[in-house]
């Protein structure tokens, strides 16, 4: 079975210093799927941030950055310049 | 056992287009990653570019602006397409499997085929 | 140019111990990226040695061992034998490009 586990369940960021989200593949190799990534907000509702390779939601080109690390079966989100209205829960999905 | 056979012409014209391609056996092409791997004669190896079953590609920077690679699932195969050589590009070619072991957590080589030897003259 | 340096030779009598070395930076050994060791015979495709570090793949012999500090790894051989004569490569990957493969020049060993 396939496991997507996020780094760490909480991430305190500065407001315009770079950060950085990762989501560890547990049981296969993370580049044989499609990497996805989430933002979900207080009103919960879950907005489209990246999908390989370089299909980015609208709003988010700009600031976020997606990759996949294969040599640590990492999935990455970078956001570029931190600010309040990024906050919320990320998630990272993958599919074929 | 796990057998990879690289075919494609020994002779490219310079200016041409160089097309190999790696034909798998012993096991699916699906789980894992494919590689082409030169080395020109008498010298080190240099990592070409690899191709996901996914269909996304990495490509080593100094050679991609040149390079296509290309998968194809039923086949159990995989292919190169280098254009515009020159005679820098003379070298054995080599296709190889890329394992991520879970075990381990850990990346690497675990099959190669045995190389064609490409060369670009007139 | 390769990006991990390796010395070009060494040589060693049988039953010797011999070590390779393969040097690297912060952007590759030094973030944490595990290092791969190939052996390529005369006029044969490589063959790998030691994963992770330090595992071997069953079927290699335990006189092969790999060791990892910092930006560096090492390769030892013990009991040196006249078929361990061959060109070894030290293989990792590069943070600053997705998924980039890299290899050490290459160390020909000479079994005296």
């Known amino acids: 079975a396939i496991e997507l586990v996020p780094e760490h369940q909480t991430v305190p960021v500065s407001i315009g210093v770079p950060a950085t989200l990762r989501c560890s593949m547990k049981g296969e190799a993370i580049g044989n799927y499609y990497i996805n990534w989430y933002r979900k907000t207080q009103g919960n509702t879950m907005t489209f941030i990246y999908r390989e390779k370089d299909i980015y939601g609208p709003g988010f080109k700009d600031n976020f950055q997606g990759d996949i690390d294969i040599a640590k079966n990492l999935a990455v989100l970078k956001i570029l310049a931190p600010s309040e209205r990024d906050e919320g829960s990320y998630y990272c999905a993958c599919d074929t | 056992e796990v057998q990879l056979v690289e075919s494609g012409p020994g002779l490219v014209q310079p200016s041409e287009t160089l097309s190999l391609t790696c034909t798998v056996s012993?096991?699916?092409?699906?789980?894992?990653?494919w590689n082409w791997i030169r080395q020109p004669a008498g010298k080190g190896l240099e990592w070409i570019g690899r191709?996901?079953?996914?269909?996304?590609?990495n490509y080593n920077p100094s050679l991609k602006s040149r390079l296509t690679m290309s998968l194809d699932t039923s086949k159990n195969q995989f292919s190169l397409k280098l254009n515009s050589v020159t005679a820098a590009d003379t070298a054995v070619y080599y296709c190889a499997r890329e394992k991520w072991d879970s075990s381990s957590s850990a990346l690497y080589f675990d099959f190669w085929g045995q190389g064609t030897l490409v060369t670009v003259s007139s | 140019q390769s990006v991990l340096t390796q010395a070009p030779s060494v040589s060693g009598a049988p039953g010797q111990r011999v070590t390779i070395s393969c040097t690297g930076s912060?952007?590759?050994?030094?973030?944490?990226?595990?290092v791969k060791w190939y052996q390529q015979l005369p006029g044969t495709a490589p063959k790998l040695l030691i994963y992770g570090n330090t595992d071997r793949p069953s079927g290699v012999p335990d006189r092969f061992s790999g060791s990892k500090s910092g930006t560096s790894a090492s390769l030892a051989i013990t009991g040196l034998q006249a078929e361990d004569e061959a060109d070894y490569y030290c293989?990792?990957?590069?943070?600053?490009?997705?998924?980039?493969?890299?290899f050490g020049g290459g160390t020909k060993l000479t079994v005296l």
């Open positions: 293989q990792s990957y590069d943070s600053r490009l997705t998924g980039y493969v890299v």
């Open positions: 012993g096991d699916s092409i699906r789980g894992y990653y």
């Open positions: 912060s952007s590759n050994i030094g973030a944490d990226y595990d």
């Open positions: 191709i996901f079953t996914t269909g996304n590609t």
